[in-house]
Interface confidence: medium
């Protein structure tokens, strides 16, 4: 029962992670206008995403525009787009694998095969979490680097946007959920639930430690 409960928790976490990842990828809030001191550096608020950017005028009117050319986009933006889409597709594949091996499905009858499918789905979710983490951390690094670069004009300085925080959350949930699914699977048929719990308790801190390693505050 504990194993089934952990499986359900793992899948719920990965589903939440996937939704977070989707919203993070779609929202044009990866980079936002920097505030320096008490005043905003430009008259408008600028939001930049992977697919479009938006300018919010002081009047409250918002104008969004999709990036013009696919070919001329900077390589970091193209890479972030690709990784985001791949991460979402990988997570979907992980979900399909999980459903094939879930306790409550009849796709696969044999217990060992089910366990292997659940373990595989857990690994796939962990991979998805890492793929989500790469563009988010890379973009955050670029924002922080530009913030302190004297040859980046003030109008181009940006701060970390809500999409990045959602991305970190998505990655954390996918890693945690995937980790839980990996932990619910016995390495052999003879071990009981206590074995899964023991494995879970030792690996959980290692998984939960991940997202907090990234500095998100000390950049202003």
């Amino acid at each position: 029962m504990a194993s089934a409960g952990m499986q359900i928790l793992g899948v719920v976490l990965t589903l939440l992670g996937w939704v977070n990842g989707l919203v993070s990828c779609a929202l044009p809030m990866w980079k936002v206008t920097a505030f320096i001191g008490n005043s905003i550096v430009v008259a408008q608020v600028v939001w930049e995403g992977l697919w479009m950017s938006c300018v919010v005028q002081s009047t409250g009117q918002m104008q969004c525009k999709v990036y013009d050319s696919l070919l001329a986009l900077p390589q970091d933006l193209q890479a972030a787009r690709a990784l985001c889409v791949i991460a979402l597709l990988v997570a979907l594949f992980g979900l399909l694998v999980y459903l094939a091996g879930a306790k409550c499905t009849t796709c696969v009858e044999e217990k060992d095969s089910k366990a292997r499918l659940v373990l595989t789905s857990g690994i796939v979710f962990v991979i998805s979490g890492v793929l989500t983490l790469i563009p988010v951390c890379w973009t955050a690094h670029a924002i922080i680097r530009d913030f302190y670069n004297p040859l980046v004009a003030e109008a181009q300085k940006r701060e970390l946007g809500a999409s990045l925080y959602l991305g970190w959350a998505a990655s954390g949930l996918l890693l945690l959920g995937g980790g839980l699914l990996c932990c619910t699977c016995p390495s052999g048929g003879s071990q009981g639930p206590s074995h899964y719990m023991a494995r879970y308790s030792t690996s959980a801190p290692a998984i939960s430690r991940g997202p907090s390693e990234y500095p998100t505050k000390n950049y202003v």
């Epitope: 430009v42 930049e48 995403g49 990036y67 986009l73 670069n149 040859l151 980046v152 004009a153 109008a155």
Partner: antibody, heavy 126, light 108 residues
Framework: QVQLVQSGAEVKKPGASVKVSCKAS????????IEWVRQAPGQGLEWMGL????????NYNEKFKGRVTMTTDTSTSTAYMELRSLRSDDTAVYYC???????????????????WGQGTLVTVSS | EIVLTQSPDFQSVTPKEKVTITCSVS???????LHWYQQKPDQSPKLWIY???NLASGVPSRFSGSGSGTDFTLTINSLEAEDAATYYC?????????FGGGTKVEIK
Amino acid sequence: QVQLVQSGAEVKKPGASVKVSCKASGYTFTNYLIEWVRQAPGQGLEWMGLINPGSGGTNYNEKFKGRVTMTTDTSTSTAYMELRSLRSDDTAVYYCARRSPLGSWIYYAYDGVAYWGQGTLVTVSS
Amino acid sequence: EIVLTQSPDFQSVTPKEKVTITCSVSSSISSSNLHWYQQKPDQSPKLWIYGTSNLASGVPSRFSGSGSGTDFTLTINSLEAEDAATYYCQQWSSYPHTFGGGTKVEIK
């Protein structure tokens, strides 16, 4: 509208210095980089360097290092380019330009308009 | 430094003809860092195409840009008299932001 107005033509002797000014208007001066480009008579464009008026940060073309100094006066929204130890091959039109936003993705969604000054002819002759 | 080599140096073309100017870069750069300028006699240069393929404001649609890595192209599909000018490519990939030698387009 955005305007960059440069100082008038100069005639200098070899070994002297020249200081070209570039007065900006129509935008927030500290928000954009200013680059300097020169063009010898009948020749192509040559990038000299840039300055960030907001921070004073500069990057010079190695060819001019030690001879060129770029500065700004934010109170008057004016950029300056001083070239020392002038030689006859420094005879050229010197342009200042306000560069399109770089270092951020928004550049790829909005027109990459670069504004240029009208140019300042500096003649170096003995 | 990155060296940009333009070809041809000079092109004499009849109106309505297609013009192709190439810019060869000494080391591979991102397409977002390659720009084209138009300059007419006794005028300041004008940004013409930015990020390889994006037309700047007011540039007619007969102009186009393409390329990647080390080879970039500016194309005028049907030359008009007002297009007579010198065209320069420039890279913003690394300092110094070097220019190509220029291609002068003349109307026959």
